[in-house]
Every structure is written in structure tokens, then in C-alpha cells.
């Protein structure tokens, strides 16, 4: 059976598949996917691996016309050096020669400078070329090589391996050498897979059921401690309670070199956040930090300095800290929009069970700002989701040069973040650069300004607008209000109506159903329209929603299905990359962003069209 | 950088108890192989009992089994040794010692290399 990583590589012109006979054959043969002889994997960026020989594809020079065979691998062999040139080209790196059927007098495959069919190569089964299953490093932990990645095949004993192993173990913990030949180098590390007793690994907190991993002589930089902790299905740790953060500074005492957790301001527009998603409401900075030099984006623990936070450049080399489990911050669901019939007072805008109002003109001092909205029967806004803050940003009124509180404050506990409406905090959207909490002056209260409704934390006592936000009292028969210019059923947002189609489709589908509703696949123009669709569907508990873009007419250009340029995106981390498929929001979490799916799969969807007795606006000229 | 700290010895009367401490300090327990070894006056240094770094999976010296046990706390980075029915016998200098992993596990690692080495902590048993 082909693991993931493996596969067969096939050329469509002939519909054979590369078979190693032996290490100075490689051929052709019909393909068979039980043949150990057809498998091969990326054993590095540029390495590909023969699974039955353990030895890589190379060549004796770059040069035209010679035979590819197979070579004990070595990472720094120019002749084992492969990238895939555009389309299904497989290419000797940094050179226009290719990998080759060969031809009727040549059965072993050669490198050419032909780019023909006979060049071009597909995984067997698929459309994508070799490079779409490509190579992952895999981060080690304890041992000796400091949290270096496998190296495989790696040489035991004289016998190679191109898998984490138990071998000379008698608990069967899997291990790799993190060098080709641990005979010599004596290098090894852990694998971060699932076996019996890996859990060993982790401390569990008693109270919380949470878990945490403290590699302490690891050397990485943080985006590879966060891909060590991701394949271990956790992530950097993230600390939002004040237990939390006492817990890990028992646990780390004992050492003194600083260890990566999840903190970063790696978002261009935002501030400061948690890799997990964890709203940032408690702070633990050392005295000084964050300092504000540019490219100090990430923030390591210091065991030494009494487990205080530091922000540091990401391309340090140090331990860091992993944490899986329990989080308390799922328990507190928030009802979909479509869930709960609101009902809001006059000049009262209704979503999801609550009702807000904008405050703008009458400016207050945060203390009084709350008074107000607790006459009113309700308080300063909480803000739970991303939802929720796209909701308030689209269709409040919410203004960009705005400056207004809202009901977060650190007034109880220093540091230590809370609404004022008692709700717990799950979600924070800072600015850049922020929460700065200036030590010169007391800055305990939040407010929401810029463009996009960050979050900046402010001194309690600045006249400024505010958001009040009450739950809606009328529970009676929800009116479905028809929207000028709209159908029933269709909401209006701007010039536009939309609909949520309910039947799972695939895209085809979902652009079909739209055009018979003389509507087409969502648009999205701007950041404005992205926040409405974002609180219009990103509640809800279905995972996806198709938006119009697809890659299905040129593979790497993303279109709409209507001639609309493509003049804003919303990508989800490590999207697009490089397979094609078509667009689909998603929900929850990671509400609103974009993820590349593929096409015949099914989800609901978004149908846009020209609300009734708009005039159209002139297309902007590029 | 590595640190060992023995803690806990004393002077005990024969059939007492005492609990013996280890505490590392300069990286985490689970990168090593602690052993806590002895040597009484004008003898050689013996292995008493070993923990491996990973899984804890425990070795002792046949004239210690069933008096002593060793444990381990990675949230402390301390590895302790209960000694209880202290015999006359067992009178030396207790050492701690932490050995880097390596990939091979037979299940002993009293006969590792050890490469750190605590200073040492003397244990009297005498009525």
C-alpha cells in the first residue's frame, strides 16, 4: 500500500510508470501500484527517494542524453537536484534539462533538453505534478541533534532506513537520524508520531487536562518550533489565564535559555496574537518589551526571568514550548444569526440575538460610556467573534476614522483583560502594535478604530464615542422582512442582494443554481464586502461556502465566473499553494478565509446579483 | 550547562528511611538517563539505580531490589531515590549522574556512560 508521501510517477503520453529494475536501471514499466520498484518519495526539497532501494534519482554530469539512475543519497549533490518547471516538467535544478521517457534504442529514463510530451510527468492517479506531494521536514525532539529535522534515508548499523525506526530499542519508541549516516555522526532525535508512550512527552496540567511539551534544547526558529508543534497536532503554546502562565513557570525553573510559545504580530495589518487563535488578553511582558524594533515579530518564555515575555526575531534559534488538549474557550457558543429571531428597539441594529447601537456623536469617558449603555438595558459591546466584528464594521455604520470603546478592559486585574458585560473573552483583533499598555500612562480600557475595527488599548479617561450592544427582548414570530430592491429570502449589503444557497453542490452546481436565479457565484471587491459575507455565513455550522473563484480555466490564475477582476483576496494560511481547485469561504474559527477546494466537492453556497434600481457605477479603469 | 544538585542524605539508624534528591537544572529530565550511583570508603563506585529518560523505565542493583525506589518528576526536574530498611551496608558518598540519550534502549542503564556527574551526598547508616 502507497503511504502519503509516496507515489508512482507516470507519463500520460505512453500511460506507463518509472520503474527502478535496479540501481543502474531505471525504466518504464505498466503501472502497478503494489510494486515497490515503482515508488518514490521527496526525501528533501529536491531529493527523490526510490522506496525500494533507498537510494535517490540522479545523474553522472548536466549534461544532455544521460542516464538517470539511482545514487546513495546526499543532500549536497548537485546532480541529485530536482524542481518541477512549469506545468509537469521535472527538471536537473537550475538547468533546462529534463527527466525523459528515452526513446525505442534507450529503455532507461534520461535527462533531455526536450520539453515534449515524453518530458512531462504526472502522479500516477492524479493531475498533479510531482511536486504536489512534496517533501514535509520532519522536526525531531529530545535526543541529541537539537530538534534537526530526519534526514532519510539515514544509515544504522549499515542498514538504511527511509522511515522513523525502533530498531536497537526494546520499547519501541520510533526514532531517525538527523544526518544520513548516524553510524559516523551519532545524531538522533525522536519522531514526532503517535506510539506507545509518546505521551510521556507531555506534562499534563491536572487542572486543565492541558498538555505541554517543553523542548528545551531544541534549536529552531519560530516558524519551525510552530511546524514541530502542527505535526504533533498541537501548536506554540498560547497563554490566556493567569493559572496558565503560574503552571508553566513551575515547569520551566529550572532551565535558562528563552523557548518559543505562540505570540507574534506576524499579520501585516494586526497586532499582537496567539498561533492558536487564542484571544491575547493577558500580558506578561519582561520590562521593556515589546520593544518596537522592526522585525522583533515573535516572543519567546524566559525561564530565567521569571517565565516573563520577550519579543525577538523569528530567525533566533531557540526551545521552544507546545500545548494540546482542553481549551475553555469552545464552551461558550454563540447562536448563529439564523438561529435567533431578533428583535431590536428603534435605531437598534439586530444580530444574533443581541442589539447594537453607535454612539457617536455624544462623547464619553469610558466609565460614563458604560453607564450609558447600562441605562439603556444593555452594556459596552463584547465581541466574541470575527462574525460578530465584521457585523459591527458592515453594517452598523461603523465609520474608518472612528475612535469608540467598546467593553473591554484590564481596570480588575492588571494585564489581565475582561469584558465588562461578564462574558468570557474568546476573541481579541488588536492593531498593529497593539495592546501597547504605555507605561507612562494607565491604559486600561479598549477602543475600536481604523478601518477595519482593531483594537487599541486607550487611557479610561478620553471623551470618545462607544457601542452599547443589549440582548433582543421580543422572542415573538420572527417578520421576514422583504429588502428594498431584493427578493424574499435575499439580503441586501450595499448595491448587491444575496442568498445562501442550502443545497450542498458542487461549484458547477452552485454556478448553475445561481445563474437560474439569475444571480451568479459570490464576488468579493473589498475588504467591506468581505466582512459582510464573513457575518452573512460564518456562523453557521456548515464548514464551506463556494464564492465565485476557480482556477479551472487557467491553472494558477484565479477568475470569477463573471468577467469581474480579481482585485482583492482572503486566503486562509498556506492557501493557495499550488493545487488548483475552486474557492470556498470558510466558517468558524478561521471565518471568512479562503481555502482552495476541489471542485466536485459539495458545500452550500453564496448567489450575488444587482439589487433592483441601483444604478450601476462606472467600472474602475485600470 | 548541565547541573546536577543531590539533596537529602543524612545520618539514620538501621531499618530507617531516607529520600534522596536530584535536581537538574540547565535543560529539562526527559533529554536524560539519570543513575544514581555510590562508593563507600576503599571501595569501587557501584550503580544502585537507573531511570531512563523516556518511557521510566527503572533498573536496580540486586542488593538494593525491593528497598529502593527511584522516580522521577519532570514538572520539578528532579529525580529522587527512596531508600527504606537502610542497612549498615549501605553507608557510602550517593552520587547522581545524567547520561544523554542515544537511540539504543535495552531496558538497563546501569551500564551507560554517564556524562554529568552532581557532587555527591553522604548517607551514614549506624546505630
Known amino acids: 500500500l502507497l503511504d502519503t508521501r509516496q507515489f508512482l510517477i507516470y507519463n500520460e503520453d505512453h500511460k506507463r510508470c518509472v520503474d527502478a529494475v535496479s540501481p543502474s536501471a531505471v525504466q518504464t514499466a505498466a503501472c502497478n501500484q503494489d510494486a515497490e520498484s515503482q515508488k518514490f518519495r521527496w526525501v528533501s526539497e529536491s531529493q527523490i527517494m526510490s522506496v525500494a532501494f533507498k537510494l535517490c534519482l540522479g545523474v553522472p554530469s548536466k549534461t544532455d542524453w544521460v542516464a538517470i539512475t539511482l545514487y546513495a543519497c546526499d543532500s549536497k549533490s548537485e546532480f541529485q537536484k530536482w524542481e518541477c518547471k512549469n506545468d509537469t516538467l521535472l527538471g536537473i535544478k537550475g538547468e533546462d534539462l529534463f527527466f525523459n521517457y528515452g526513446n525505442r534504442q534507450e529503455k532507461n529514463i534520461m535527462l533531455y533538453k526536450g520539453s515534449g510530451l515524453w518530458s512531462r510527468w504526472k502522479i500516477y492517479g492524479t493531475t498533479d505534478n510531482l511536486c504536489s506531494r512534496g517533501y514535509e521536514a520532519m522536526y525531531t525532539l529530545l535526543g541529541n541533534a537539537n530538534g534537526a529535522t530526519c534526514a532519510f534515508p539515514f544509515k544504522f548499523e549499515n542498514k538504511w532506513y527511509a522511515d522513523c525506526t525502533s530498531a536497537g530499542r526494546s520499547d519501541g519508541w520510533l526514532w531517525c537520524g538527523t544526518t544520513t549516516d548516524y553510524d559516523t555522526d551519532k545524531l538522533f532525535g525522536y519522531c514526532p508520531l503517535k506510539f506507545e508512550g509518546s505521551e510521556s512527552l507531555w506534562n499534563k496540567d491536572p487542572l486543565t487536562s492541558v498538555s505541554y511539551q517543553i523542548n528545551s534544547k531544541s534549536a529552531l526558529t519560530w516558524h519551525q518550533a510552530r511546524k514541530s508543534c502542527q505535526q504533533q497536532n498541537a501548536e506554540l503554546l498560547s497563554i490566556t489565564e493567569i493559572h496558565e502562565q503560574t503552571y508553566l513557570t513551575g515547569l520551566t525553573s529550572s532551565l535558562t535559555s528563552g523557548l518559543w510559545i505562540g505570540l507574534n504580530s506576524l499579520s501585516f495589518n494586526s497586532g499582537w496574537q496567539w498561533s492558536d487563535r487564542s484571544p491575547f488578553r493577558y500580558l506578561n511582558w519582561l520590562p521593556g518589551s515589546p520593544s518596537a524594533e522592526p522585525g522583533k515579530s515573535c516572543v519567546s518564555l524566559n525561564p530565567g526571568k521569571n517565565a516573563k515575555w520577550e519579543n525577538l526575531e523569528c530567525v533566533q534559534k531557540l526551545g521552544y514550548i507546545c500545548k494540546k488538549g482542553n481549551t475553555t474557550l469552545n464552551s461558550f457558543v454563540i447562536p448563529s444569526e439564523s438561529d435567533v429571531p431578533t428583535h431590536c428597539p428603534s435605531q437598534w441594529w439586530p444580530y444574533a440575538g443581541h442589539c447594537y447601537k453607535i454612539h457617536r456623536d455624544e462623547k464619553k469617558i469610558q466609565r460614563d460610556a458604560l453607564t450609558t449603555c447600562r441605562k439603556e438595558g444593555g452594556d459596552l459591546t463584547s465581541i466574541h467573534t470575527i462574525e460578530e466584528l465584521d457585523f459591527i464594521i458592515s453594517q452598523l455604520g461603523y465609520e474608518p476614522n472612528d475612535e469608540l470603546w467598546i467593553g473591554l478592559n484590564d481596570i480588575k486585574i492588571q494585564m489581565y483583560f475582561e469584558w465588562s458585560d461578564g462574558t468570557p473573552v474568546t476573541f481579541t483583533k488588536w492593531l498593529r502594535g497593539e495592546p501597547s499598555h504605555e507605561n507612562n500612562r494607565q491604559e486600561d480600557c479598549v477602543v475600536m478604530k481604523g478601518k477595519d475595527g482593531y483594537w487599541a488599548d486607550r487611557g479610561c479617561e478620553w471623551p470618545l464615542g462607544y457601542i452599547c450592544k443589549m440582548k433582543s427582548r421580543s422572542q415573538g414570530p420572527e417578520i421576514v422582512e422583504v429588502e428594498k430592491g431584493c427578493r424574499k429570502g435575499w439580503k441586501k449589503h450595499h448595491f448587491y442582494c444575496y442568498m445562501i444557497g442550502h443545497t450542498l453542490s458542487t461549484f458547477a452546481e452552485a454556478n448553475q443554481t445561481c445563474n437560474n436565479e439569475n444571480a451568479y457565484l459570490t464576488t468579493i471587491e473589498d475588504r467591506y464586502e468581505q466582512a459582510f459575507l464573513t457575518s452573512f455565513v460564518g456562523l453557521r455550522p456548515e464548514k464551506y461556502f463556494w464564492t465565485g473563484l476557480s482556477d479551472i480555466q487557467t491553472k494558477g490564475t484565479f477568475q470569477w465566473t463573471i468577467e469581474e477582476e480579481v482585485r482583492f483576496t482572503h486566503w486562509n494560511s498556506d492557501m493557495p499553494g499550488r493545487k488548483p481547485g475552486c474557492v470556498a469561504m470558510r466558517t468558524g474559527i478561521a471565518g471568512g478565509l479562503w481555502d482552495v477546494l476541489k471542485c466536485d466537492e459539495k458545500a452550500k453556497f453564496v448567489c450575488k446579483h444587482w439589487a433592483e434600481g441601483v444604478t450601476h457605477p462606472p467600472k474602475p479603469t485600470t | 550547562q548541565v547541573q546536577l544538585q543531590e539533596s537529602g542524605g543524612g545520618l539514620v539508624q538501621p531499618g530507617e528511611s531516607l529520600r534522596l534528591s536530584c535536581k537538574l537544572s540547565?535543560?529539562?529530565?526527559?533529554?536524560?538517563?539519570i543513575g544514581w550511583f555510590r562508593q563507600a570508603p576503599g571501595k569501587e563506585r557501584e550503580g544502585v539505580s537507573c531511570i531512563s529518560s523516556i518511557g521510566g523505565s527503572a533498573n536496580y542493583a540486586d542488593s538494593v531490589k525491593g528497598r529502593f525506589t527511584i522516580s522521577r518528576d519532570n514538572v520539578k526536574n528532579t529525580v529522587y531515590l527512596q531508600m527504606n530498611s537502610l542497612k549498615p551496608e549501605d553507608t557510602a558518598i550517593y552520587y547522581c549522574?545524567?547520561?544523554?540519550?542515544?537511540?539504543?534502549?535495552?531496558?538497563?542503564?546501569?551500564?551507560?556512560?554517564?556524562?554529568?556527574w552532581g557532587q555527591g551526598i553522604q548517607v551514614t547508616v549506624s546505630s
Open positions: 549522574a545524567a547520561e544523554a540519550q542515544t537511540p539504543y534502549n535495552d531496558g538497563d542503564c546501569t551500564r551507560a556512560s554517564y556524562d554529568y
Open positions: 540547565g535543560f529539562t529530565l526527559d533529554y536524560y538517563d
